[in-house]
């Protein structure tokens, strides 16, 4: 009996530019002889329904139809037909099919590959055209994929040390698509510094599918207006 097992759940998520290994494990009742077996990997794009050959391995020969694509002969010996794709790109997301032939048997499995890009976040103070005692803080998130992103603002005071979400005076702009397919967005927080306590810590919180934990950038309101704290300068740009 010949069986193929792919990533549990049927989906693999990988960071943009990563060297991804798309899993495909072979289960066979006898020891594998790699000189008498065949492995073919196919890819079907998210945008069109045509299947394309990515890599094939037959006995003493292997061929990559996508530069750098490889199945390890040394791992194949122990039943691992996983496909390594170095420098994965956004457009390479889609369905991957692993087809294994141990004559006369054939088995296959499919997996969806999602490619994500994590946002970089930075805080800026915009002083241009602002009224007296007014500050505009901008939280720029850039280079993320997919487009869906959630940006919120929180504050912590000495009185209330637990973060409180700010809903007023927050404007989040439209997402802008970059040439490489990733996205940028900017969220703005308008503050009236005369009405806020010095020492209040403000945080821009970015949540995205590519992040295990939210990305947090913070600044502390100081007595001297328009001065950004050391916390913001040193800790919060990624």
């Amino acid at each position: 009996d010949l069986k193929v097992e792919m990533m549990a759940g049927g989906t693999q998520i990988t960071p943009l530019n990563d060297n991804v290994t798309i899993f495909c494990n072979i289960f066979y009742s006898q020891p594998l002889n790699i000189t008498s077996m065949g492995i073919t990997w196919f890819w079907k794009s998210l945008t069109f329904d045509k299947e394309v050959k990515v890599f094939e391995f037959f006995g003493d020969h292997q061929e990559a139809f996508r530069p750098g694509a490889i199945v390890s002969p040394w791992r194949l010996k122990s039943g691992d037909a996983s496909l390594r794709l170095p420098g994965i790109q956004l457009e390479e997301a889609g369905e991957y099919r692993c087809e294994v032939v141990v004559t006369p048997l054939k088995a296959q499995g499919t997996v969806q590959l999602e490619v994500v890009a994590s946002p970089a976040s930075r805080l800026l103070l915009d002083q241009v055209g602002m009224k007296e005692n007014e500050d505009k803080y901008m939280c720029e998130s850039s280079g993320f994929y997919p487009e869906a992103i959630n940006i919120t603002w929180e504050k912590q005071t000495q009185k209330f040390p637990h973060p409180i979400e700010i809903s007023e005076d927050v404007i989040t702009g439209p997402t802008i698509k970059n040439m490489d397919g990733t996205f940028n967005v900017t969220s703005c927080l308008k503050l009236n510094s005369s009405q806020e306590d010095p020492g209040t810590v403000y945080q821009c919180v970015v949540r995205h599918a590519s992040l295990h934990t939210p990305l947090r950038s913070n600044f502390t309101l100081t007595a001297a207006r328009h001065s950004l704290s050391e916390t913001e300068k040193t800790d919060n740009f990624s």
Epitope: N25, S78, G79
Partner: antibody, heavy 120, light 111 residues
């Protein structure tokens, strides 16, 4: 920085078993196989086998088949080599080594070695 | 099993001179256009250190006085200008077939 840190020296009696650990850090554990190689005093190098942390698949040198068991715990990036029914000629330094498997096959980083002495 | 025979067993070379170590395989270690022959250096009390893989590719951080050549069954490790720190035992290893096998080693000393 890639590091492989092996467990300490062992002294065993003939017939006993020994289990050597190899803790990996500084790289993605599942991207490389782990080779095990031994070296008897004053002798050359001898390949015991390797394990693929991706699926737990193992390849053994026939000479050790039935006596050696290679395992991994991916949650702590650690590989293990257990050798049973020890004999005096199993006295050697046992090495784990990270093994590239996609673009060639070679052991590019080695553990410091674990001395196993089998003596009655 | 593929048997690897190194020659010579030991070698004494003057500082600054060329050192050459040969490795002969009992059958070809070539596969799909590549040669699966690696070279390691081992100093007393230390683990082996990778020098050359795929017959001729220098491992990162290895000085370029080390070079490897050959294909099929005959391979050579060359040190173009021997340095004091090159005193060690050198091993060839094939990784084409299991079990992966090593040569018996060549001890390199300073003359």
């Amino acid at each position: 920085e890639v590091q492989l840190v092996q467990s300490g020296a062992e002294v065993k009696k003939p017939g006993a078993s020994v289990k050597v650990s190899c803790k990996a850090s500084g790289y993605t554990f599942t991207d490389y196989n782990m080779d095990w190689v031994r070296q008897a005093p004053g002798q050359g190098l001898e390949w015991i086998g390797d394990i693929n942390p991706n699926n737990g698949g193992t390849l053994y040198n026939q000479k050790f088949r039935g006596r050696v068991t290679l395992t991994v715990d991916t949650s702590i990036s650690t590989a293990y080599m257990e050798l049973s029914r020890l004999r005096s000629d199993d006295t050697a330094v046992y090495y784990c080594a990270r093994s590239e498997v996609f673009y060639g096959n070679y052991a590019d980083y080695w553990g410091q070695g674990t001395t196993v002495t089998v003596s009655s | 099993d593929i048997v690897l025979t190194q020659s010579p067993d030991s070698l004494a070379v003057s500082l600054g001179e060329r050192a050459t170590i040969n490795c002969k395989a009992s059958q070809s270690v070539d596969y799909d256009g590549d040669s699966y022959m690696n070279w390691y250096q081992q100093k007393p009390g230390q683990p082996p250190k990778l020098l050359i893989y795929a017959a001729s590719t220098l491992h990162s951080g290895v000085p370029d006085r080390f070079s490897g050549s050959g294909s099929g069954t005959d391979f050579t490790l060359t040190i173009s200008s021997l340095q004091a720190e090159d005193v060690a035992v050198y091993y060839c290893q094939q990784s084409k077939e299991d079990p992966r096998t090593f040569g018996q080693g060549t001890k390199l000393e300073i003359k």
